[in-house]
């Protein structure tokens, strides 16, 4: 399954969401800085289009869920979170429409769901982040920043092994 | 903190083009835009493009469109700005600013004489 | 596009003196406006960014203030060193750009 041109212009238009819904200086949020410790070799070691495709669905759908939220819509604006929804549910199309053209319907890898709880458990540090820090707009802001980080590097390994194949 | 370094000073001839790096030690570079601003002698300051680098490519000042690339590599969080056609009234001190206000470089002296 | 203009051009006072510089744009401004401080020679300071929330390490005697299109940058009572010029500044997120005021000179009376 080739994800469509689209899929890759959906994902830029993701980053430029994520970028104009910054409300505040990260100068005054420096000391709520935070590693989240994305697992990135998770996307590196899914060496196949077949077992990429489940990983970055997850990784999609837990940023759709941490954006989803009540807190979440308090935080940032609207306008530009509904059509930051919009990306991410084309996104999830996309991806699940790979799926049920067969990619990855076989028996799943056990490495594949280790990949996905790795990708949920980073998520759970996420939430349990913001829920510390009280959501306030500090804490916003560095996860913004971290899932703009995150979603970038998940989606060029995307991109690399599309043109490896 | 985060430090931003800049390249030394330039001298250069009319015609040509000068790149000056920036790189920046410390902090989240891929995501917080890397603008360039410049301030010829006895002048005000004057923006001149600006990048994203996760998401690209560059955005630049009308004025400077045609000569000017602005680029950056991740992997050793360095930021680039390349000024082609230099004229005479380019002579300017060029800075790098982190798009949080705060962050700016020391500064890097292009200075174009024949 | 959006344009910043500053006044007064140039501000004569004595020290002591209270200073009230403004910036007017020429749209709606969100957050990200900022003012910086910059001496000849020197790479300009951040004062003052988001409008009215103090950097570090910049004293008590400048504010900022203001919203939509007025903002102001005020020094309570000059001293020696705030001789200088101020500019301010504004952000856009995307596409990522800076747009600055033409500068106003601070200079001793």
């Known amino acids: 399954c080739d994800l469509p041109q689209t899929h890759s212009l959906g994902s830029r238009r993701t980053l430029m969401l994520l970028a104009q819904m910054r409300r505040i200086s990260l100068f005054s949020c420096l000391k709520d800085r935070h590693d989240f410790g994305f697992p990135q070799e998770e996307f590196g070691n899914q060496f196949q289009k077949a077992e990429t495709i489940p990983v970055l669905h997850e990784m999609i759908q837990q940023i759709f869920n941490l954006f989803s939220t009540k807190d979440s819509s308090a935080a940032w604006d609207e306008t530009l979170l509904d059509k930051f929804y919009t990306e991410l549910y084309q996104q999830l199309n996309d991806l699940e429409a790979c799926v049920i053209q067969g990619v990855g319907v076989t028996e799943t890898p056990l490495m594949k769901e280790d990949s996905i709880l790795a990708v949920r458990k980073y998520f759970q540090r996420i939430t349990l982040y913001l829920k510390e820090k009280k959501y306030s707009p500090c804490a916003w802001e560095v996860v913004r920043a971290e899932i703009m980080r995150s979603f970038s590097l998940s989606t060029n390994l995307q991109e690399s092994l599309r043109s490896k194949e | 903190q985060v430090q931003l370094v800049q390249s030394g000073a330039e001298m250069k001839k009319p015609g040509s083009s000068v790149k000056v790096s920036c790189k920046d030690f410390g902090g989240t570079f891929s995501v917080y835009g890397v603008n360039w601003v410049r301030q010829a002698p006895g002048q005000g300051l004057e923006w001149m493009g600006g990048?994203?680098?996760?998401?690209?490519?560059?955005n630049y000042a009308q004025k400077f469109q045609g000569r000017i690339t602005i680029t950056a590599d991740e992997s050793t969080s360095t930021a680039y700005m390349e000024l082609s056609s230099l004229r005479f009234d380019d002579t300017a001190i060029y800075y790098c600013v982190r798009d949080d206000n705060e962050y700016w470089g020391q500064g890097t002296l292009v200075t174009v004489s024949s | 596009e959006m344009v910043l203009t500053q006044s007064p051009a140039t501000l004569s006072l004595s020290p002591g003196e209270r200073a009230t510089l403004s910036c007017r744009a020429s749209q709606t401004v969100s957050t990200f406006l900022a003012w910086y401080q910059q001496k000849p020679g020197q790479v300009p300071r951040l004062l003052v960014y988001d409008i009215s929330s103090r950097a570090n390490g910049t004293p008590a005697r400048f504010s900022g203030g203001g919203s939509g299109t007025d903002f102001t940058l005020t020094i309570s009572s000059l001293e020696l060193e705030d001789f200088a010029v101020y500019y301010c500044?504004?952000?856009?997120?995307?596409?990522?750009?800076?747009?600055f005021g033409g500068g106003t000179r601070v200079e001793i009376k």
């Open positions: 990048l994203i680098p996760v998401i690209g490519p560059a």
């Open positions: 500044q504004w952000r856009s997120n995307w596409p990522p750009s800076l747009t």
